[in-house]
Interface confidence: low
């Protein structure tokens, strides 16, 4: 038998420095977690102790903090090189700065293979990007070889900016021929490494013949066997075992997100490359693991350029700003309320005595809120904090929509509720009640909107044939997160102001903020 140790990360999202337990900015260093310096310590410890070790990343290193805002991916290449990653799969966020923003800082600089079998380049890009990413890579590990085949969410064109010269194919359809090719090359130990979410990871394990292990990302799935060490609730055991269509037991793993854990999976193969056993658990990278001094020194050197971003206090919060995905993708969260209030405030235009304002409504995809802000840092809110909350550099735009389109949008908001998907809407100037016991497409039981043509604003039922103005992220106006009905049915779309600027201006204006959860979004069963 031959034993392989797979160390894996996914959805690190620019958390190069250690963070607080909820993956926002580190406030109390003795309780902070993750970061590349701490990760390196643990990786090196395992490399010294065990003979056959692979360090893999399943995508979405890009986007999430000021590190990416400033360094635009150069930091990813530099520190992944320093940690000596063996391979990385492309995630959707690797395309956030377009293909050029992937090629120059990362693909050309990485000293490790970057993989995706289901992304095919066409047109002039094909020659430009040729060889810079690969469908698979055969890696020597000890006396054996291991094949790594990559995949990326086929939803990437809806989630990021890959342009028109990359085609994202169905994962399973694209993976099978590459795995077959590896088999013809006498590679009998094959890992599928990719970024399509846990449901697709399980399907790949089930459907793709010849894949021995699946290492995934995108859904920030936390798997754990036994008592979990932190706040994350496991979605299943680690590894999650899928029985393939041809009867094999295929381990599937993922390691939550934000560099908080290092996935640790030990696989035992027989001489024919069959998995005999698999076991392990994510390792919580808490403060009991010291930060490697050389990597930490390098982080501090790179940090200098960022410091002028983090010193400017915009205002103060006296409450915790809950921007966690656990809240904002499932229920009303006060970070969503803050952002929506800022969006409306930014659009105040008292132009007509009949109207208190020309627009009263805001919608905001919960998936666009990427971080909380802890009030215990003296209440300070900085540009850097907001860049972690709103890292995508989008704009908050003004659209005109019919009530019927809004109703469809709110149905879409909860059509697959409970899967931590980004389309769950945060709101302003809207009161919505959902009944999740009803079938998808018929879950909105009450939808009231704040009047504009009134001297005292109050909530009235949405009228299907009335035209309403709504402030929303350009991402939604462009049909992102599946809101195709907005893109297809909007009557007018005006580009707005940069998202961080809107919120920072509002906070500067308010000076002290204390947004609450106040019943904008409610759930009922049966008669409400």
């Amino acid at each position: 038998a031959w034993e392989l140790t797979i160390l894996h990360t996914n959805d690190v999202h620019s958390r190069l420095e250690q963070t607080s337990e909820d993956s926002s900015k580190c406030v109390n260093a003795s309780r902070c977690m993750g970061g590349v310096a701490r990760l390196f310590t643990k990786v090196q410890q395992i490399r010294r102790a065990e003979p056959n070790v692979l360090l893999l990343d399943a995508g979405d290193q890009y986007q999430g903090t000021i590190w990416f805002t400033v360094y635009k991916g150069a930091e990813v290449a530099h520190f992944m090189n320093a940690l000596r990653y063996d391979a990385m799969a492309l995630g959707n966020h690797e395309f956030d700065n377009g293909v050029e923003g992937l090629i120059e800082p990362l693909l050309k600089e990485a000293k490790f293979p970057i993989l995706s079998a289901n992304i095919k380049a066409k047109g002039p890009l094909a020659s430009q990007i040729s060889g810079l990413y690969l469908p698979y890579k055969v890696l020597p590990v000890g006396d054996e070889v291991v094949g790594i085949v990559g995949y990326t969410s086929k939803e990437t064109p809806f989630l990021s900016n890959p342009g028109t010269n990359l085609v994202f194919e169905d994962e399973i359809t694209a993976l099978q021929p590459e795995v077959d090719k590896l088999k013809t090359l006498n590679v009998n130990k094959i890992i599928a490494l990719g970024h399509s979410g846990f449901e697709m990871d399980k399907l790949i394990a089930q459907k793709v013949r010849g894949v021995d292990v699946v290492v995934g990302g995108h859904s920030n799935t936390f798997l754990y066997t036994g008592n979990p060490p932190s706040k994350e609730v496991p979605a299943g055991k680690y590894p999650f075992i899928v029985t393939s269509d041809d009867g094999r037991k295929v381990p599937v793993v993922q390691a939550y997100a934000f560099g908080k854990y290092l996935g640790y999976l030990k696989i035992e193969f027989d001489e024919r490359g069959n998995v005999i056993s698999s076991h392990g658990n994510p390792i919580l990278l808490n403060s009991s693991i010291p930060e490697d001094p050389s990597i930490k020194a390098d982080i501090n050197k790179w940090r200098i350029k960022l410091d002028n971003y983090s010193t400017q206090e915009l205002g103060k919060t006296i409450v915790y700003l809950d921007g966690s995905s656990q809240s904002c993708r499932f229920r009303e969260c006060n970070m969503g309320n803050l952002i929506c209030d800022a969006m409306i405030n930014n659009n105040l235009r008292h132009t007509d005595e009949m109207f208190w304002n020309h627009v009263s409504m805001c919608i905001l995809n919960g998936g666009g809120i990427r971080s909380p802000i802890d009030e215990r840092n003296n209440g300070t809110i900085t540009w850097e904090n907001l860049a972690a909350v709103l890292p995508f550099g989008g704009t908050f735009d003004l659209v005109q929509l019919k009530g019927s389109t809004l109703k469809k949008a709110f149905e879409h908001s909860v059509h697959r509720y409970g899967q931590s998907t980004g389309e769950f809407l945060q709101v302003g100037g809207i009161h919505v009640v959902y009944d999740l016991s009803r079938k998808p497409g018929d879950r909105v039981v009450k939808l009231d909107v704040l009047c504009t043509k009134c001297r005292v604003p109050s909530y009235d039922p949405l009228k299907m044939d009335e035209v309403y103005k709504v402030i929303l992220p350009n991402f939604l106006a462009n049909g992102g997160d599946g809101f195709q009905m907005i893109k297809d049915e909007l009557l007018r779309h005006d580009s707005g102001d940069q998202d961080i600027n809107v919120v920072s201006t509002y906070i500067s204006k308010m000076k002290v903020i204390y947004p609450a959860v106040e019943g904008r979004i409610k759930f009922s069963t049966g008669s409400h």
């Epitope: 400017q312 235009r349 020309h358 704009t395 003004l398 005109q400 005006d494 940069q498």
Partner: antibody, heavy 119, light 106 residues
Framework: QVTLRESGPALVKPTQTLTLTCTFS??????????VGWIRQPPGKALEWLAH???????YYNPSLKTRLTISKDTSRNQVVLTMTNMDPVDTATYYC???????????WGQGTLVTVSS | DIQMTQSPSSLSASVGDRVTITCRAS??????VAWYQQKPGKAPKVLIY???YRYSGVPSRFSGSGSGTDFTLTISSLQPEDFATYFC????????FGQGTKLEIK
């Protein structure tokens, strides 16, 4: 295609009032979010923003010139008018109108009109 | 009001050179900065907005960076048509412009 064109007198006397008209095409000032501004540039010097007007008739003026400036629009004729009172030789400049984008940067400019203040 | 101090006021360079122009705001303007190119007798043309976003149709040799008070316009490899005057502009409060940088052929 967006175009803007400034018109007005090439020469005005000190203490007189300057009236400039910006005639534009390719967009409508009744479109939500749209704005048109005026910027001037004395010969060989820097640009100075004067005023702008929004689609909803909201008006903004440079604080240092506010008492002398009036901006207005005629949406149906696709025109924006700027008046500047009590002209002085230091007001000699090329006056540009421009379409406001997002907050207040200017993507589309007219070719400019040179106004000389002299007796 | 917010002063925008641009440096240098003039600059001589050759085709192919890398050129950097800086602009300092008298107070924090976040990333609310645009850069313009102006040729003699012509209106300014926007190159960069929101500090680092290249305007549609602007060649990739032009790039902007900065946040807060310090901003930079970089031309990676000067072309003959790039000799002109460059202005920065903040729009965090009412718009103000830098005094300009005249880029001349060496």
């Amino acid at each position: 295609q967006v175009t803007l064109r400034e018109s007005g007198p090439a020469l005005v006397k000190p203490t007189q009032t300057l009236t400039l008209t910006c005639t534009f095409s390719g967009f409508s000032l009744s479109t939500s979010g749209m704005g048109v501004g005026w910027i001037r540039q004395p010969p060989g010097k820097a640009l100075e923003w004067l005023a702008h007007i929004w689609w909803d008739d909201d008006k903004y003026y440079n604080p240092s010139l506010k008492t002398r400036l009036t901006i207005s629009k005629d949406t149906s004729r696709n025109q924006v008018v700027l008046t500047m009172t009590n002209m002085d030789p230091v007001d000699t400049a090329t006056y540009y109108c421009a379409r406001r984008e997002r907050w207040a940067w200017f993507a589309y400019w007219g070719q400019g009109t040179l106004v000389t203040v002299s007796s | 009001d917010i002063q925008m101090t641009q440096s240098p006021s003039s600059l001589s360079a050759s085709v192919g050179d890398r050129v950097t122009i800086t602009c300092r705001a008298s107070q924090n303007v976040f990333t609310n900065v645009a850069w313009y190119q102006q040729k003699p007798g012509k209106a300014p043309k926007v190159l960069i907005y929101s500090a680092s976003y290249r305007y549609s149709g602007v060649p990739s040799r032009f790039s902007g960076s900065g946040s807060g008070t310090d901003f930079t316009l970089t031309i990676s490899s000067l072309q003959p048509e790039d000799f002109a005057t460059y202005f920065c502009q903040q729009y965090n409060s009412y718009p103000t412009f830098g005094q300009g940088t005249k880029l001349e052929i060496k």
